[in-house]
Structure formats: structure tokens, C-alpha cells
Interface confidence: low
């Protein structure tokens, strides 16, 4: 399997909520043996390998973000942790995953990774990651609401409030 | 900070049993798998087993399988090791681990001082 | 089971020199799931770089570590007096995790 980043970029105004997504590709085995480990955390584009250091996202680390179940399951994190630091990560049947961030501010800029382990019998298989880039603005020459530039062209697409929803 | 205490260890027949303990401070113990890896006197390290962060899955090298339990109460941050059958080739210095992730998917980022254990008629 | 093989046993060299100690894995690594660990008598071992080439939370950036699939290397650039320890590799990349079996880095 593997995983997709829809945009690989995320411009936002300060104050505006936003949702970072990734997308499971490919056959997932949906066994009784197999689950599915996936999590968000901040990193840096290093000399080696994009996502290779693993930060935590206000405070919280990939362990307190993370979701486990089976296959192509719905999901979504322990809310009051989370949810104290403006943070929900949540996925769905469809191999969608997502952490929304709330209140965003300058701060938050950065490089965001999901990643995505496969578990088979309790032994690590598979271990796969996307990367994109979240720009916070301010000021006059940020954008009312979050615009997002698709991973595959440069076409941006703007992303008013009611967009960002969970997914329970 | 991360601490990681093993206790337990001593001198013990062969055939008997011993129970090691780790605990654990200076973080999410219910975050991290754990592990335990021990060392022959003046020989290398050799891995002895994993517990998930939950207690819900483990695993074993070969040669202490059948013979070791791992477990943990993660409402007292505490691993444990519990050895039945004890032989003269498990006499070790026996360390506690961390699993950097929830399962054994990531390295050992911290280690506790060990505890030795000497199998001995 | 994933055999690792440390080369030189044993390394004799003098502060400010480079070292290079090598790694080398049975069968492939996938991922380059391989960690390195610095040990002193009486301590317990010590994370030095972990994913083959990244250095642990406040390892000096003297210590760096390269390769991928089978064959992997850890050099320290410039000895300091505290590097003179022995050096384990391991790989993470299967069931049962192995070690290698250590390389002794020794004063000259």
C-alpha cells in the first residue's frame, strides 16, 4: 500500500481552523492478524530523508496522536487530550485520514507527516509517510480562508470554513 | 526525565525461577512498547523480548521462548520479566528498554542500568 | 534471523583521529531499520543514531552514521577522550532483533 497526500501544500490565515489529509492507496489486507498504526507528527525536510525526525504537534507526540484498528476502519484519537490542544485526528472507511487543527497561529507553520505502519502478527511489515507544508499568515496579505495546492499541480484551491469537518 | 530502575536480579539454581522488575518514570509509560535485552558477561547484547504498549501482544528470542514471560501493569509503570527454568547460559546482566513506538516498530531510545542475574549450582 | 557482522573487532586509534566502524546485515534491511549504540564498561548502552543515519536526541554531530540495505557505517570524525567505548549496531527490521556482535574502539 501506500499513502497520498491530496495537497501538498496549506496556506492559512491566523485564527482559521484547518484539516491535513492523507489517503491509504493500494490493497489493504483486512485479516484478523493485521492492524493499521497511523499518526501525525511535525518534522523538518532533512539532509537524509523528509519526515525522518519526529516532533510533537503542540505539545502532543505521535504516540498521543495516533489511531489503531484494523484495515479501512473508522477512527479517531482520545478526544479530551486532543481536543485541550486544539487537535483531532480521525479516519474513515475509505482510507481518508486526517488531524484537524483549530485556532491556527503562526506557530503552527511547518512541515506535517502522517504515517502509517502495518502490523501483521505483531511484527512490523510496512511503514509508510507523507509529507506537506503548513503556511500560517498574517497580516494583509493572508488569505481569508485556507487555500490548498494539490500535491500533482500547482492549481489552488480555496477552502472556506464549512469545509473542515470531522470524519467519526 | 526518562528513568528505567530493573530489580530482582540475584543468584539462583539452575531449574529455578526469578521474577525481574523495571520501573519506569519521566514519561507515558502506556505509550511505549518495552522491552528486555540482556548481556553474558563480557559478551555482547542479545534482545529477550517485547511487550506492546497495552499488554496486548509480546514476542521472544528462540532461546528463552517457553521459558519467559513478559508483562506489565501500566497503572503501577511497571514492566516485569518472569523466568521459569533457569540455566547457566541465561546468567546475564538483564536491561530494561524503551520502544521509541507503541509497538516494536522503532529502536531503543532508553535503557535502564541492568540487573544481574547468575544462574549458579 | 538477520545476522549482523561488526568489523574491526577491535579498533585502535588516537584522539582527534576519524574512526569508521562498519555494519554489515545477512540479508537486506528494508527501510534502513538499523540503530547504533555506544556501551562503556559497567553502563548501560547509549542511543547514538537510529533509521541508519539519525542522530539521537544529544549526540554530538562528531558521530554520523550512512549505508542502506546490507552494508552500514558509523564514523566519529574526531575522537574525544569519552568516545573510547564499544559500539553496537542492531537492526530493527525483523523479528528476533540482532546485534551485532560489538566493535571495541581502544586508545592507541
Known amino acids: 500500500f501506500k499513502v497520498a497526500t491530496p495537497y501538498s501544500l496549506y496556506v492559512c490565515p491566523e485564527g482559521q481552523n484547518v484539516t491535513l489529509t492523507c489517503r491509504l492507496l493500494g490493497p489493504v489486507d483486512k485479516g484478523h492478524d493485521v492492524t493499521f498504526y497511523k499518526t501525525w507528527y511535525r518534522s523538518s525536510r532533512g539532509e537524509v530523508q523528509t519526515c525522518s525526525e519526529r516532533r510533537p504537534i503542540r505539545n502532543l507526540t505521535f504516540q498521543d496522536l495516533h489511531l489503531h484498528h484494523g484495515g479501512h476502519q473508522a477512527a479517531n484519537t482520545s478526544h479530551d487530550l486532543a481536543q485541550r490542544h486544539g487537535l483531532e485526528s480521525a479516519s474513515d472507511h475509505h482510507g481518508n485520514f486526517s488531524i484537524t487543527m483549530r485556532n491556527l497561529t503562526l506557530l503552527d507553520s511547518g512541515l506535517y507527516c502522517c504515517l502509517v505502519v502495518e502490523i501483521r502478527h505483531h511484527h512490523s511489515e510496512h511503514r509508510v509517510h507523507g509529507a506537506m507544508e503548513l503556511q500560517v499568515q498574517t497580516g494583509k496579505d493572508a488569505p481569508s480562508n485556507c487555500v490548498v495546492y494539490p500535491s500533482s499541480s500547482q492549481e489552488s484551491e480555496n477552502i472556506t470554513a464549512h469545509h473542515h469537518h470531522h470524519h467519526h | 526525565q526518562v528513568q528505567l530502575v530493573e530489580s530482582g536480579g540475584g543468584v539462583v539454581q539452575p531449574g529455578r525461577s526469578l521474577r525481574l522488575s523495571c520501573a519506569a518514570s519521566?514519561?507515558?509509560?502506556?505509550?511505549?512498547?518495552m522491552h528486555w535485552v540482556r548481556q553474558a558477561p563480557g559478551k555482547g547484547l542479545e534482545w529477550v523480548a517485547i511487550?506492546?504498549?497495552?499488554?496486548?501482544?509480546?514476542d521472544y528470542a528462540d532461546s528463552v521462548k517457553g521459558r519467559f514471560t513478559i508483562s506489565r501493569d501500566n497503572s503501577k509503570n511497571t514492566l516485569y520479566l518472569q523466568m521459569n527454568s533457569l540455566r547457566a547460559e541465561d546468567t546475564a546482566v538483564y536491561y530494561c528498554?524503551?520502544?521509541?513506538?507503541?509497538?516494536?516498530?522503532?529502536?531503543?531510545?532508553?535503557w535502564g542500568q541492568g540487573t544481574l542475574v547468575t544462574v549458579s549450582s | 534471523e538477520i545476522v549482523l557482522t561488526q568489523s574491526p573487532a577491535t579498533l585502535s586509534l588516537s584522539p582527534g583521529e576519524r574512526a569508521t566502524l562498519s555494519c554489515r546485515a545477512s540479508?537486506?534491511?528494508?527501510?534502513?531499520?538499523l540503530a547504533w549504540y555506544q556501551q562503556k564498561p559497567g553502563q548501560a548502552p547509549r542511543l547514538l543514531i537510529y533509521d541508519a543515519s539519525n542522530r539521537a536526541t544529544g549526540i554530538p554531530a562528531r558521530f554520523s552514521g550512512s549505508g542502506s540495505g546490507t552494508d552500514f557505517t558509523l564514523t566519529i570524525s574526531s575522537l574525544e577522550p569519552e568516545d573510547f567505548a564499544t559500539y553496537y549496531c542492531?537492526?530493527?527490521?525483523?523479528?528476533?532483533?540482532?546485534f551485532g556482535q560489538g566493535t571495541k574502539l581502544e586508545i592507541k
Open positions: 542492531q537492526q530493527y527490521n525483523s523479528y528476533p532483533y540482532t
Open positions: 511487550i506492546w504498549y497495552d499488554g496486548s501482544n509480546d
Open positions: 519521566g514519561f507515558t509509560f502506556s505509550h511505549h512498547a
Open positions: 540479508q537486506s534491511v528494508s527501510s534502513s531499520y
Open positions: 528498554a524503551r520502544d521509541s513506538g507503541f509497538y516494536s516498530s522503532y529502536y531503543f531510545d532508553y
